[in-house]
Interface confidence: low
């Protein structure tokens, strides 16, 4: 398996935005890289978002995704937004080198994202 | 050394309040227990607060302390308030059995407290 590194812990901002870098030790100069973010909580794993990065397309994820990301060299800068306290969990970065062959797969150890819901602002009189 | 248990991670609320339990394995029925909270950040250790609990006085800490706490059996429920993002760090629970002899000392592994500053509320017009 290919080695994937990501930070152990990240705090979401009070606006519910968390950013972290997912770095992979590519055994070759990949021209097409697929990055998937998985969330693990209570032994359940769900896919949060996924994007394919190429040499020409270094900005990924669909418009309706909660993730945005940019690729640079062997790392992807990921941002997840719209997070609430209930979204606290382990966010795992999965990297696949799609092209050129051979195919490589690497899965990080996960980034524990902590989210705190903000206190509501008092109503203005 | 006496065993002291405390949670690995605690999130402060958006109001800057963090609570956790510090539990100690007392080798005897201590009538006077001193609890000190230490903060470790950048290899610097500073004392945050300290209180002595007795059978009669189960509520500790001085009025001007940022800590409040209650003692029950072999555990102390600690609350630290007024926390800001810059206060994020490892908070270590140190427990001393002061009376009756013999004296016992136990130090926990620390609780990583994460603090996120809230976004300011918009000015009311």
């Amino acid at each position: 398996a290919m080695h994937v590194a990501q930070p152990a812990v990240v705090l979401a901002s009070s606006r519910g935005i968390a950013s972290f870098v997912c770095e992979y030790a590519s055994p070759g100069k990949a021209t097409e890289v697929r990055v998937t973010v998985l969330r693990q909580a209570d032994s359940q794993v769900t896919e949060v978002c996924a994007a394919t990065f190429t040499e020409k397309n270094t900005v990924g994820f669909l418009d309706d995704s909660i993730c945005t990301g940019t690729s640079s060299g062997n790392q992807v800068n990921l941002t997840i937004q719209g997070l609430r306290a209930m979204d606290t969990g382990l966010y795992i970065c999965k990297v696949e080198l799609m092209y050129p062959p051979p195919y490589y797969l690497g899965i990080g150890n996960g980034t524990q994202i902590y989210v705190i819901d903000p206190e509501p602002c008092p109503d203005s009189d | 050394a006496m065993h002291v248990a405390q949670p690995a991670v605690v999130l402060a609320s958006s109001r800057g309040i963090a609570s956790f339990v510090c539990e100690y394995a007392s080798p005897g029925k201590a009538t006077e227990v001193r609890v000190t909270v230490l903060r470790q950040a950048d290899s610097q250790v500073t004392e945050v607060c300290a209180a002595t609990f007795t059978e009669k006085n189960t509520v500790g800490f001085l009025d001007d302390s940022i800590c409040t706490g209650t003692s029950s059996g072999n555990q102390v429920n600690l609350t630290i308030q007024g926390l800001r993002a810059m206060d994020t760090g490892l908070y270590i629970c140190k427990v001393e059995l002061m009376y009756p002899p013999p004296y016992y000392l136990g130090i926990g592994n620390g609780t990583q407290i994460y603090v996120i500053d809230p976004e300011p509320c918009p000015d009311s017009d």
């Epitope: 030790a25 070759g28 050129p100 062959p101 | -």
Partner: antibody, heavy 125, light 107 residues
Framework: QVQLQESGPGLVKPSETLSLTCTVS????????LSWIRQPPGKGLEWIGY???????NFHPSLKSRVTISKDTSKNQFSLKLSSVTAADTAVYYC???????????????????WGQGTSVTVSS | DIQMTQSPSSLSASVGDRVTITCRAS??????LAWYQQKQGKAPKLLLY???NLQDGVPSRFSGSGSGTDYTLTISSLQPEDFATYFC?????????FGQGTKLEIK
């Protein structure tokens, strides 16, 4: 043990298609890749291209328009076809098992770890 | 394409000598480098992969070093069977180009 054996006509006429076969044993065609390399008389080595275990292929840009690499898993055979040959294609042609080696931090480094003995091809009318 | 420049192109040495051959890549190849030995009329044989890792069955007198763009193959004490041509090859993105070779001859 791992063995590779190239075979094909020793003489090919200009403008025709050169067809070579590499018969392998001792390893699975569904697990490893295979590269073709050539060496013109008295010269260095030139990588032609590879086919990976999943059927993906990749070729040297200078030969891409003329090369086809395929495999027949049932016969344990790989084949190389080079069209529109000229005298410049005269060389010893080698097939080599292409491996992703793993060590240390768990990602692969490729190498051509086993080679056939080579087959000499002359392009002449 | 990444170019591999190997030096020297030929080398005369005696049995027992310590020999070094260098290979320079035109860009960082992140240790994705292999060294091969080829004897007259024979196929190349893999000596080292990942710049420093000895292939199974290769004598320990062969060693590799380097990182980034500059790599070295060292034979600590030449044996009669070591006189051959040596090639480096990068495997960092295709095409996987070879150095032009170093012919090691008996002095």
């Amino acid at each position: 043990q791992v063995q590779l054996q190239e075979s094909g006509p020793g003489l090919v006429k200009p403008s025709e298609t050169l067809s070579l076969t590499c018969t392998v044993s001792g390893f699975s065609l569904t697990s490893y890749g295979l590269s073709w390399i050539r060496q013109p008389p008295g010269k260095g080595l030139e990588w032609i291209g590879y086919i990976w275990y999943d059927g993906n292929t990749n070729f040297h840009p200078s030969l891409k328009s003329r090369v086809t690499i395929s495999k027949d898993t049932s016969k344990n055979q790989f084949s190389l076809k080079l069209s529109s040959v000229t005298a410049a294609d005269t060389a010893v042609y080698y097939c080599a098992k292409t491996e992703g080696h793993y060590y240390g931090s768990n990602y692969g480094y490729y190498a051509l770890d086993y080679w056939g003995q080579g087959t000499s091809v002359t392009v002449s009318s | 394409d990444i170019q591999m420049t190997q030096s020297p192109s030929s080398l005369s040495a005696s049995v027992g000598d310590r020999v070094t051959i260098t290979c320079r890549a035109s860009e960082n190849i992140y240790s994705n480098l292999a060294w091969y030995q080829q004897k007259q009329g024979k196929a190349p044989k893999l000596l080292l992969y990942a710049a420093t890792n000895l292939q199974d069955g290769v004598p320990s007198r062969f060693s590799g070093s380097g990182s980034g763009t500059d790599y070295t193959l060292t034979i600590s004490s030449l044996q009669p069977e070591d006189f051959a041509t040596y090639f480096c090859q990068h495997l960092w993105g295709t095409p996987y180009t070879f150095g032009q070779g170093t012919k090691l001859e008996i002095k």
